[in-house]
């Protein structure tokens, strides 16, 4: 059952060489590499390599552990982001602006534009950049839930730090919530984390894309550093495939 | 590289068999199978049972993922449990009784009898048994910190519940600090999750083993009930070998 | 001009041996290797006449063990019914029929294969290749296999008939 | 997924996971180990085909990548994916033991 | 654990993560792939020795289950245990789309 | 192996019209961008025009830009420049070439088609 | 448009000879840069693209590097086939744009 000889290591390189090219392939549901025909001259466009920095840090990020992979999770991802709408809409004019919270709100039109199906989406990320921040600040997030009541998704404890870090919260079940639903702007909140005891439940923490007037150093605005949503679906395309392939083992 | 050819099931199988009698006894660091001439008569201890039952109860929940598994947890740990300090115990008189909280004490030298070292635990697990619940409760685990502090470890959100059921908590890193220091008791407090916003900050659900004040429904206590800490630890006698064995490869 | 081959002994290695040019070098390969496209090593040729296995699918969940014959070239099965060629269930995909690379391997079509030994006017000649006498019994199985040209003809006893998925004659129905 | 549901309600020939239950007694002729008498230990077992790509791919081979070799190794096994661990209770002299051992159980296979 | 940090550093004979970089245009002469330029996949590699154990147990042989037999495989195989992403750009028409390939790293090994 | 052969050359007055061809073999020609590029006598190189694989999209050099056509015939595989308004400075060897996506590389080229522009 | 300077415009060097050969863009055109030989009476051919990448069947003695706004093309021994003239070109935006060329003579 195990055959112990010596080891062509060239061979090996080249049969993993040569498997890789079919698996890449295999992954993108690609019959034969795409056509180039079309790409235009010059770099890819600022927005794309952004997007493709935003999934490499989150790469990088991410611990290196094996998850057993269903059929689904095999194929290829397409990344997108849909930026948060920005805080002069009107919708933010009803949420009175308080001390211990911060709202950021998505036009799910453009949600369902990047992703057609919930079924499709495989993760869904909330992405803030925080700026420096002089105290360990607790925070949490919630999803606008109905009217005015607030589900509680997750918390966070936040270091200390001098420079700027961007944080990610898995958002994926409410994204594909809000896919289901008819809603035409969704939202979160993040809030400092309040105590029973405490009194002191100032949100200390500066995110970026948020003027804010609660104190002097106001947050700079960079459109693309605003919060998003990173996304990671099946493209529609590949999607009919999905149904599990059991009856062709 | 690889070899296809008629494989001998029962072989295998038999070669599986012959590896697991190795791994078993290498897991537990065994040279032989131990002598049972000292095995007292009689079925095994209520406690052990109880014991063995909580770690089989906990593997059926635990979803089957591989871990990278670092050369430590390949070995086999041994299973301890600590009970809460009881109630009457006069560390309790210090937190007031109130409506949000409930507080957990533990005895550091009962932790450090079945964990001699921080380094040799692995896993370490708060277990509480809820009793039915009417509403949904969104809950918080707190450490003892200082005097009079407290800091945030986890959250969970209780489904209502006709019937008992064991919850669990995380601790390692807790008791792990807990066993460096030099402290005499050492505790936790499960509250009720406070909004910025609401009021209603009751800790509506019952934990087997307080009698609660603040509802006519007193919990029953059955002694082995009470909350405790679930320890999984690698063995004194074991731990000499835990050094990287990477010379010997 | 600098030699490499002396600089680097490894260059070439375990397939050939390396050649100093002007300003660069070449693997001179050894037999059953070529060069790789810049000719700085050597890599196996698949000859067209080493046997192995020829599988009938890539359908069936075992694939491993639909195995038409097992000691035949690689266009003797793919230039016929086989869908992948190898051996220890490590397979080469015969290429797509109508592909440059069919054409390149099977340059006479479906069901014919090039004899170097026969050389017409400096032409190899084509020879029709026997699907009954590589495959007969996994192809005709509870029949008479007739080789034609090209393919191949199964004739079923009465009351059967040829299932050209299952290649067997099967019990008609009645 | 190639695992219990699946491989032990289908003859796959492939690799799958197989069903080996290990009684302590009758397999390894152990009488020390109290609790439990025997436990699922199961196994994988199964080819997993190697498939040279062409240059000209096509649908019906890479169909076949997921399954037989996802991780595009240079020679594909058939190895555990999903374990679980297993307590045991055992004397050291009078004094029994509960004792947890990792990835005992295998739950599913995969082509790796 | 058989990862790069000691793999590559050694001379392991035995199952370890061998390094493999993969430049697309050059390696598999591919220029559709726009980001990233090549990768590095790696590979595992090296023999997990079979140990049959005996009623008679001793240390030596004990020790050697860890790391070439952890799984008590009827086989033991050297197969990936940690694995990382990729996210790759390329062009479908005038579209540039972002994608992320699963488990393309090979980051460590384990006989398994 | 891939071939590209240009032709379509000549003299022709300041003014007039001129179509060059350039004639593809050897690889899937649709898939590709294909560009000209033109060398005076005694000069540099100096890009011409470039058309995307399925035609859909052109680029032109400011300096032909409105006088010259760049389109292609995927059945026929056959690439085309029809150049109109000829002048003298447009005299030249018009090579084409194909484009490897990505950095727009020129890979492979004809062996060019000379065009002299004079009165 | 974007203008490459190329430099020296030629250079005589002898077999065996290291050359290296500059080639300066008037804004940053990051790696988007390709390098081309060409001998009298021939179409040129790809030796560098993408700034330092070696074209497929191109001698190693070949070399790019650089990014940005400068780049160098070295070849590490002159051969005899190697005198021709060698052109830059930019692939950061339309107009494409090619440099001036550098001519190697024989010595």
């Known amino acids: 059952l195990s055959t112990c000889k010596t080891i062509d290591m060239e061979l090996v390189k080249r049969k993993r060489i040569e498997a890789i090219r079919g698996q890449i392939l295999s992954k993108l549901r690609l019959a034969s590499p795409p056509s180039q025909g079309e790409v235009p001259p010059g770099p890819l466009p600022e927005a794309v390599l952004a997007l493709y920095n935003s999934t490499r840090d989150r790469v990088a990020g991410e611990s290196a552990e094996p998850e057993p992979e269903p059929e689904a999770d095999y194929y290829a991802k397409e990344v997108t982001r849909v930026l948060m709408v920005e805080t002069h809409n009107e919708i933010y004019d009803k949420f009175k602006q308080s001390t211990h919270s911060i709202y950021m709100f998505f036009n799910t039109s453009e949600l369902r534009e990047a992703v057609p199906e919930p079924v499709l989406l495989s993760r869904a990320e909330l992405r803030l950049l925080r700026l420096k921040l002089k105290v360990e600040q607790h925070v949490e997030l919630y999803q606008k839930y109905s009217n005015n009541s607030w589900r509680y998704l997750s918390n966070r404890l936040l270091a200390p730090s001098d420079s700027p870090e961007w944080l990610s919260f898995d958002v994926t079940g409410v994204v594909r919530q809000w896919l289901s639903r008819g809603g035409e702007i969704e939202g979160f909140r993040l809030s400092a984390h309040c105590s029973c005891d405490s009194r002191d439940n100032t949100l200390q923490v500066d995110i970026n894309g948020f003027t804010t007037g609660r104190r002097g150093d106001l947050a700079t605005i960079h459109g693309m550093n605003r919060p998003f949503l990173l996304l990671m679906a099946t493209p529609l395309e590949r999607a009919q495939h999905l149904q599990s392939s059991r009856h062709r083992r | 590289l690889s070899t296809c050819k008629t494989i001998d099931m029962e072989l295998v199988k038999r070669k599986r068999i012959e590896a697991i009698r190795g791994q078993i006894l290498s897991k537990l660091r065994l040279a032989s199978p131990p002598s049972q001439g000292e095995v007292p008569p009689g079925p095994l201890p209520e406690a052990v049972l109880a014991l063995y039952n909580s770690t089989r109860d906990r593997v059926a929940g635990e979803s089957a993922e591989p871990e990278p598994e670092p050369e430590a947890d390949y070995y086999a740990k041994e299973v301890t449990r600590v009970l809460m300090v009881e109630t009457h115990n006069e560390i309790y008189d210090k937190f007031k009784q109130s409506t949000h909280s409930i507080y957990m004490f533990f005895n550091t030298s009962e932790l450090r009898e079945a964990v001699p070292e921080p380094v040799l635990l692995s896993r370490a697990e708060l277990r509480l048994l809820r009793l039915k619940l009417k509403v949904e409760q969104h809950v918080e685990l707190y450490q003892k910190y200082s005097n009079n502090s407290w800091r945030y470890l986890s959250n969970r959100l209780l489904a209502p519940s006709d019937s008992p059921e064991w919850l669990s908590f995380d601790v390692t890193g807790v008791v792990r600090q807990w066993l460096s220091r030099g402290g005499e008791i050492e505790g936790f407090r499960l509250s009720a999750h406070c909004s910025c916003d609401s009021r209603d900050n009751t800790l509506q659900v019952d934990i087997n083993g307080f009698t609660t004040g603040r509802r006519g429904d007193l919990a029953t206590i059955h002694g082995m009930n009470r909350p405790f800490l679930l320890l999984m630890a690698t063995p004194l006698e074991r731990a000499q070998h835990l050094q990287s064995s990477r010379h010997r490869r | 001009d600098i030699d490499e081959c002396s600089q680097d002994p490894s260059l070439c290695l375990p397939h050939g041996a390396c050649k100093n040019l002007q300003g660069s070098y070449v693997c001179v390969c050894d037999e059953g290797f070529t060069p790789t496209q810049d000719q700085h090593g050597c890599e196996e040729v698949e000859q067209p006449h080493h046997k192995k296995e020829c599988y009938l699918n890539f359908d069936d969940t075992v694939f491993c063990d639909s195995v038409l014959a097992t000691n035949v070239t690689q266009q003797e099965c793919c230039c016929s019914l086989g869908a992948g060629w190898g051996d220890h269930c490590e397979i080469y995909p015969c290429p797509v029929y109508s592909s440059a690379e069919f054409h390149s391997l099977c340059p006479d079509g479906k069901g014919y294969t090039q004899d170097n030994n026969i050389v017409n006017y400096g032409i190899p000649a084509h020879r029709d290749i026997d699907e009954c006498m590589l495959f007969g019994s996994e192809i005709c199985k509870e029949g008479k296999c007739v080789n034609t040209q090209p393919g191949y003809e199964c004739y079923c006893k009465q009351g059967f008939y040829y299932d050209g998925n299952l290649l067997e004659c099967v019990d008609v129905d009645e | 997924a190639l695992d219990t549901n699946y491989c032990f309600s289908s003859t796959e020939k492939n690799c799958c996971v197989r069903q080996l239950y290990i009684d302590f007694r009758k397999d390894l002729g152990w009488k020390w180990i109290h609790e439990p008498k025997g436990y699922h230990a199961n196994f994988c077992l199964g080819p997993c085909p190697y498939i040279w790509s062409l240059d000209t791919q096509y649908s019906k081979v890479l169909a076949l990548y997921n399954q037989h070799n996802p991780g595009a190794s240079a020679a594909p096994c058939c190895v555990p994916q999903a374990l679980e661990p297993l307590p045991i209770v055992y004397y050291v002299g009078r004094k029994p033991k509960v004792e947890q051992l990792s990835n005992m159980i295998v739950r599913s296979c995969k082509c790796s | 654990a058989l990862d790069t940090n000691y793999c590559f550093s050694s001379t392991e004979k035995n199952c370890c993560v061998r390094q493999l970089y993969i430049d697309f245009r050059k390696d598999l002469g591919w220029k559709w792939i726009h980001e990233p330029k090549g990768y590095h996949a790696n590979f595992c590699l090296g023999p997990c020795p079979y140990i049959w154990s005996l009623d008679t147990q001793y240390s030596k042989v004990l020790a050697l289950y860890n790391q070439h037999n952890p799984g008590a495989s009827a086989a033991p195989c050297c197969v990936p245990q940690a694995l990382e992403p990729l996210p790759i750009v390329y062009y479908v028409g005038r579209k540039p789309k972002v994608e992320q390939l699963s488990n393309m790293i090979v980051r460590s090994c384990k006989c398994s | 192996q891939v071939q590209l052969v240009e032709s379509g050359g000549g003299v022709v007055q300041p003014g007039r019209s001129l179509r060059l061809s350039c004639a593809a073999s050897?690889?899937?020609?649709?898939?590709?961008?294909m560009v000209w590029v033109r060398q005076a006598p005694g000069k540099g190189l100096e890009w011409v025009s470039a058309?995307?694989?399925?035609?859909?999209?052109?680029y032109f050099a400011d300096s032909v830009k409105g006088r010259f056509t760049i389109s292609r015939d995927n059945s026929k595989n056959t690439l085309y420049l029809q150049m109109n308004s000829l002048r003298a400075e447009d005299t030249a060897v018009y090579y084409c070439?194909?484009?490897?996506?990505?950095?727009?590389?020129?890979?492979?080229w004809g062996q060019g088609t000379l065009v002299t522009v004079s009165s | 448009d974007i203008q490459l300077t190329q430099s020296p415009s030629s250079l005589s060097a002898s077999v065996g000879d290291r050359v290296t050969i500059t080639c300066r863009a008037s804004?940053?055109?990051?790696?988007?840069l390709n390098w081309y030989q060409q001998k009298p009476g021939k179409a040129p051919k790809l030796l560098i693209y993408?700034?330092?990448n070696l074209q497929s069947g191109v001698p190693s003695r070949f070399s790019g590097s650089g990014s940005g706004t400068d780049f160098t093309l070295t070849i590490s021994s002159l051969q005899p086939e190697d005198f021709a003239t060698y052109y830059c070109?930019?692939?950061?935006?339309?107009?494409?744009?090619f440099g001036g060329g550098t001519k190697v003579e024989i010595k």
């Open positions: 070439a194909t484009v490897s996506s990505g950095h727009w590389d020129f890979d492979y």
């Open positions: 050897g690889f899937t020609f649709s898939d590709y961008a």
């Open positions: 058309i995307s694989g399925s035609g859909a999209a052109t």
């Open positions: 804004q940053s055109i990051s790696s988007y």
């Open positions: 993408a700034a330092s």
């Open positions: 070109q930019q692939t950061y935006t339309v107009p494409l744009t």
